[in-house]
Interface confidence: low
C-alpha cells in the first residue's frame, strides 16, 4: 500500500499515542539508486529504530511526559555510507492519555476570611497539577468542594471555582458568618481529571481550614450633636475603620448639600467642621467610603447619621403684627372670642418650644380691667367679667406676653365689639333653577352666582355671609366663593363633572354667618336655595389607571413570561382593545383583551434598561376613541457577558534582546451591571504551557500586569492567552489574547526592513 | 462509631428494577456527599453513581438514564433506584459517604439473569 506506510524519503509527522506497546511499524522508506541503506539520528531515546532497508519502527512504549515530541532526521546512504539524500525531518508528536493522577500542591492549605466579604471574591487558591496535557481533557482540572465542616441547616457558606480553584463565599457565607459562632471551619477539596466528567477520571483530594476574622467595617451608631456648638471646629463625633491599613476615606453626601459641614480624614475619623442648625436641618445621613490606592471602594459604604439636638435658641413669634378678632355685644361671660397661635421655631412637643401665654395690658380699661382672660397654654380668649356694649367702647386693644423656657415676646391682640348677630342671611331666590353643561366644561368655570342679603352691621361676622353646598354634591365637584363687599356667590366647578355618575344634581345652598346667632335665632327656610345641575354627555376616550405603568423582571427570563399588565376603563362602559407603539426592539405583545404584555424575545439589559414601550387604549366600537399611557421595563441584569479587553492592545512590544524582565498592564471590562463597587475579575493564564515564559499577577478589579519571567525570548509575535473570570452568579469566563512582539528597535520602537510585514506594532514596552 | 447498612439487593431478571439503600449512623450525614461503587468478580471497583452536598449528580456512562441516586437527610439514608437492568450490572454494590478517603459499607449483592 504504497503512500500510507512506505513511500520515498520526504519530511514526514507521524502521531503516536503514548503507554502503547508497539503494534506495527511507523514507515517503510523506499530506497532510490544509488541510496541502499538508512541511518536514523536525532532524538531516538533509543526507542526509534530504522532498519538498514528502511523499516521505521519504535522498540517500546512513548512517555509524552518525558517527551512530548521526538525530533528524528532520516538520511539515504549509499553502498559507501555516504549520505546521497536527506536527512529530512521525520517529527513524531506523542498524543497524550490520561496516565497521570492530579495532585495538589499541598495536602493541606491554610487561609482567612472575613465575615461579610463580597460574596464570589475569592480568598484562596488551591492548586493541582496533572502531568497529562492541559489542551486535552486528560489534563483539564476540577476543583469540588465534598465537605463543609461544620455544616449548619445544611447551608453552604463556600464555593469553588471548579475550573480555578478559587474559594470564595456564598451569599449565605456572606451574610452568615460569625467569627463570634464559630471561627473556624474544614473545607475537603477534590480534583479531578478529564474535566469531572468521566467515570475514569483521576482525583485528588486536599484539606482547607479556614479562619473567619471579624469584620471591623461596621456602621458606627447613629450620633446626636447639640446644635449651635461654641467648641473649636473640627470637632470629632465618629469613626469608621477598614480591616487593614492603607485604605483612603472618603465621605460621599447623597443629598448634596449646599453646605456639607462634615470631614473624614485617614484614619477613618469623622468630624463636624461647623456649627449645626437644627432649624436649618435636623438630621443628615451620608456614607463612609473605603477605598483602595487604585480608588477601587474595598466594600459597600457605610451609612452615617447624624442627628442634631435642639437647643432653646428660637423666641417665641406672633402670627402677625396685630390680630384682629370680634365679639358681640351681649355675648355671655365664657365665651370664646378667639385663639391666639403663636409659634416657635425651635424643637416640637419639647420645653423649648412650649408656649405660655398672658395678657399684660388691656386698653382701655372700660368699663374696668380684667374683661378677657386667656388659657395659658392653649391661647384661647374668653370673655371673663361681663358683656359688652358698643357704644361704651367699640374697641379693646390687648398686649399679650408670650414666653418659652427663656424667651418672652409681645404680640398685639385687637378686639371689635359688634353688633349682635339676630338677623339671619335671606336668599333673594330659594330656586335657581335648572342649569344644563356638558360634562367636559373646564374646571373653574363660574356656572351660577347666587345672593343672600343680612341686615346685621355691615363688615362684621355677623353680616358676613359663607355659602355651602350642603346637599347633591357629595363629589365636591362644585364650590361657591363669596365677594366680601357684596355677599355674592359664585358657584364655580372645582372637579371635572361626569355624566357617567351624576348626570342630574339637585343642589341644596346653605348661607350662614361666621359669627353665632344670639340665642333664640335659627336659621330657617330663607336661609336655603336649591338648584338642579344636567350634565350632558361627551364621548371620552378611555382612561388608563396609571400615566405610567411600570414591571421589572430578569433579563433571562423565558419567551412567553408575562412581563406586566395595564388597565384602562372607558367612561361610557364600551369594551377596550389594548395595543402597543414603539416597540423598536419586537421584545414584546400584548393581549388585546386584557392587557397583558408578553415577552416574544430574548430580553437584554445591556441594550437598554428600562425598555419603553407606548401602551394604546382603543374604544370597540362608538367612535373609536383612544388615549395613551406608558410602560417602562426595567431588566434586572443577569451575569451573561463574559469579560473582555476593554480596549484594543494590537501593536504591544518589547525591544530584543531583553535586558531584564518587563511587563504591561492591560484592563479588562464586561457589559454587566456593576453596583456601587465595580467589577472584581480574576485574572490567570489561559493555557499551563504559557507559565514557562509568563505571569499575569491582579492589580485591583478590573487591572492586571503581564509580566515575563525570564529574558530568552525569540524575535518574533507571541499570542499570550488570559483567562479573564468575572467571579458572577454563574461565573463566566473569557479567554483573551494579547499579541506581544519581540523586535529590534531604533531608538525606542520596532524597526522593521522596507515591506517585510504590515501591522508594525507601535506600543513598547 | 460510623456504620453503613446496605440493603435492597437480590436476584432480579434482565430488565427488571431494584431499590438499595443505605442507612449511615455515627457521622453528620448532610455534610457528606454520597456514592454507590460496584465491584464485580475479577473487575476493578467502579463509581456507579455520585451526590454530592449541593445536589450535583454524576453517574457512570454505562448506567446513565437507567440508575438514579437520592438522598433523604432526615433519614440519614442514600437511595440507588436501578431500572432496566441488565446482565453485566451484577455485581456487589457498596455504598460510600466522604468520595475514595470516605466511609465504605459491607455491600449487598446484585444478580441479574434470566
Known amino acids: 500500500q504504497e503512500g500510507k506506510f512506505s513511500g520515498p524519503l520526504k519530511p514526514m509527522t507521524f502521531s503516536i499515542y503514548e503507554g502503547q506497546e508497539p503494534s506495527q511499524i511507523i514507515f517503510q522508506f523506499k530506497a532510490n539508486p544509488p541510496a541502499v541503506t538508512f541511518e536514523l539520528t536525532g532524538e531516538t531515546d533509543n526507542i526509534f529504530v530504522i532498519e538498514r532497508e528502511g523499516l521505521l519502527y519504535y522498540n517500546r512504549a512513548l512517555d509524552r511526559e518525558t517527551r512530548s515530541t521526538h525530533n528524528l532526521q532520516v538520511a539515504a546512504l549509499d553502498a559507501n555510507g555516504i549520505i546521497v539524500e536527506g536527512p529530512v525531518p521525520i517529527t513524531i508528536k506523542v498524543k497524550d492519555i490520561n496516565d497521570n493522577r492530579p495532585t495538589f500542591l499541598q495536602s493541606k492549605y491554610e487561609g482567612s476570611v472575613r465575615q461579610n466579604s463580597r460574596p464570589g471574591k475569592p480568598f484562596l487558591y488551591v492548586n493541582a497539577t496533572d502531568l497529562d496535557d492541559p489542551a486535552t481533557p486528560n489534563g483539564q482540572l476540577y476543583y469540588q468542594i465534598v465537605i463543609q465542616l461544620p455544616m449548619i441547616n445544611n447551608v453552604m457558606y463556600f464555593q469553588i471555582n471548579n475550573k480555578t480553584g478559587a474559594i470564595s463565599l456564598t451569599r449565605e457565607g456572606s451574610q452568615e458568618l460569625n467569627p463570634a459562632k464559630n471561627p473556624s471551619y474544614n473545607l475537603v477539596i477534590s480534583v479531578k481529571d478529564m474535566g469531572g466528567q468521566s467515570e475514569n477520571s483521576f482525583s485528588d483530594t486536599t484539606s482547607v481550614d479556614i479562619i473567619v476574622t471579624e469584620n471591623i467595617w461596621k456602621a458606627p451608631k447613629p450620633v446626636e450633636m447639640v446644635e449651635n456648638s461654641t467648641d473649636p471646629h473640627p470637632i470629632k463625633i465618629t469613626q469608621v475603620r477598614w480591616n487593614d491599613p492603607g485604605a483612603q476615606y472618603s465621605l460621599v453626601d447623597k443629598e448634596k448639600l449646599p453646605r456639607f459641614p462634615f470631614s473624614i480624614d485617614q484614619e477613618g475619623d469623622i468630624y463636624v467642621t461647623q456649627p449645626l442648625d437644627r432649624e436649618e436641618k435636623d438630621a443628615y445621613v451620608f456614607y463612609a467610603v473605603a477605598k483602595d490606592e487604585y480608588g477601587k471602594p474595598l466594600s459597600y459604604p457605610l451609612e452615617i447619621h447624624v442627628k442634631v439636638k435642639d437647643i432653646n435658641d428660637n423666641p417665641p413669634t406672633c402670627p402677625s403684627p396685630v390680630t384682629v378678632f370680634e365679639v358681640q355685644e351681649n355675648e355671655r361671660l365664657g365665651n370664646s372670642i378667639g385663639t391666639l397661635t403663636a409659634h416657635d421655631r425651635d424643637e416640637e412637643n419639647t420645653a423649648n418650644s412650649f408656649l405660655n401665654y398672658r395678657i399684660v395690658e388691656q386698653t382701655p380699661k372700660l368699663p374696668m380691667d380684667g374683661l378677657f382672660l386667656i388659657q395659658t397654654y392653649a391661647g384661647m380668649l374668653q370673655l371673663a367679667k361681663q358683656s359688652l356694649k358698643k357704644q361704651d367702647t367699640p374697641q379693646y386693644n390687648l398686649t399679650i406676653e408670650v414666653s418659652d423656657k427663656d424667651f418672652k415676646t409681645l404680640c398685639f391682640v385687637q378686639i371689635n365689639v359688634i353688633d349682635i348677630n339676630d338677623q339671619i342671611p335671606i336668599f333673594e331666590k330659594s330656586d335657581y333653577g335648572n342649569l344644563t353643561l356638558a360634562e367636559d366644561t373646564n374646571i373653574g368655570s363660574t356656572i351660577l352666582t347666587i345672593q343672600a342679603t343680612d341686615a346685621d352691621e355691615p363688615f362684621t361676622g355677623s353680616s358676613k355671609i359663607l355659602y355651602h353646598i350642603i346637599k347633591g354634591d357629595s363629589e365636591g365637584r362644585l364650590g361657591v366663593d363669596t365677594d366680601p363687599h357684596t355677599n355674592t356667590g359664585y358657584v364655580i366647578i372645582k372637579k371635572p363633572l361626569d355624566f357617567e355618575t351624576a348626570a342630574v344634581s339637585n343642589i341644596v345652598f346653605k348661607a350662614e354667618n361666621p359669627e353665632p346667632l344670639v340665642f333664640g335665632v335659627k336659621y330657617n327656610a330663607s336661609s336655603f336655595a336649591k338648584f338642579t345641575l344636567i350634565v350632558t354627555d361627551v364621548n371620552e376616550a378611555p382612561q388608563f389607571s396609571q400615566h405610567v405603568f411600570q414591571a421589572k423582571v430578569s433579563e433571562d427570563v423565558a419567551i412567553g413570561t408575562k412581563v406586566g399588565n395595564v388597565t384602562a376603563k372607558d367612561p361610557e362602559g364600551l369594551d377596550i382593545s389594548y395595543s402597543l407603539r414603539g416597540d423598536t426592539r419586537g421584545w414584546l405583545k400584548i393581549d388585546h383583551v386584557t392587557g397583558e404584555i408578553f415577552s416574544v424575545a430574548p430580553l437584554d439589559r445591556e441594550a437598554g434598561s428600562p425598555y419603553r414601550v407606548q401602551v394604546v387604549a382603543t374604544e370597540v366600537g362608538g367612535s373609536s376613541l383612544s388615549s395613551v399611557s406608558e410602560f417602562h421595563l426595567i431588566l434586572m441584569d443577569v451575569n451573561d457577558n463574559p469579560p473582555r479587553l476593554a480596549k484594543d492592545y494590537t501593536g504591544l512590544f518589547f525591544c530584543h534582546p531583553l535586558s531584564a524582565p518587563g511587563s504591561l498592564i492591560f484592563e479588562a471590562t464586561d457589559d454587566d451591571q456593576h453596583l456601587f463597587r465595580g467589577p472584581h475579575f480574576t485574572f490567570s493564564l489561559g493555557s499551563g504551557s504559557l507559565q514557562n515564559d509568563w505571569e499575569v499577577s491582579k492589580i485591583n478589579g478590573t487591572h492586571a500586569r503581564l509580566s515575563t519571567r525570564h529574558t530568552e525570548f525569540e524575535e518574533r509575535e507571541y499570542v499570550v492567552l488570559i483567562r479573564i473570570n468575572d467571579g458572577g452568579r454563574p461565573p463566566l469566563e473569557g479567554i483573551v489574547s494579547l499579541p506581544v512582539t519581540f523586535c529590534s528597535c531604533v531608538e525606542g520602537s520596532c524597526f522593521r526592513p522596507a515591506g517585510h510585514q504590515t501591522g508594525i506594532p507601535t506600543v513598547g514596552m | 462509631e460510623v456504620q453503613l447498612v446496605e440493603s435492597g439487593g437480590g436476584l432480579v431478571q434482565p430488565g427488571g428494577s431494584l431499590r438499595l439503600s443505605c442507612a449511615a449512623s455515627?457521622?453528620?450525614?448532610?455534610?457528606?456527599?454520597v456514592g454507590w461503587y460496584r465491584q464485580a468478580p475479577g473487575k476493578q471497583r467502579e463509581l456507579v453513581a455520585q451526590?454530592?452536598?449541593?445536589?450535583?449528580?454524576t453517574y457512570a456512562d454505562s448506567v446513565k438514564g437507567r440508575f438514579t441516586i437520592s438522598r433523604d437527610n432526615a433519614k440519614a439514608t442514600v437511595y440507588l433506584q436501578m431500572n432496566s437492568l441488565r446482565p453485566e450490572d451484577t455485581a456487589v454494590y457498596y455504598c460510600?459517604?466522604?468520595?475514595?478517603?470516605?466511609?465504605r459499607g459491607q455491600g449487598t449483592q446484585v444478580t441479574v439473569s434470566s
Open positions: 460510600n459517604l466522604g468520595g475514595s478517603k470516605g466511609y
Open positions: 455515627g457521622l453528620r450525614f448532610s455534610s457528606y456527599a
Open positions: 451526590l454530592t452536598i449541593n445536589g450535583d449528580t
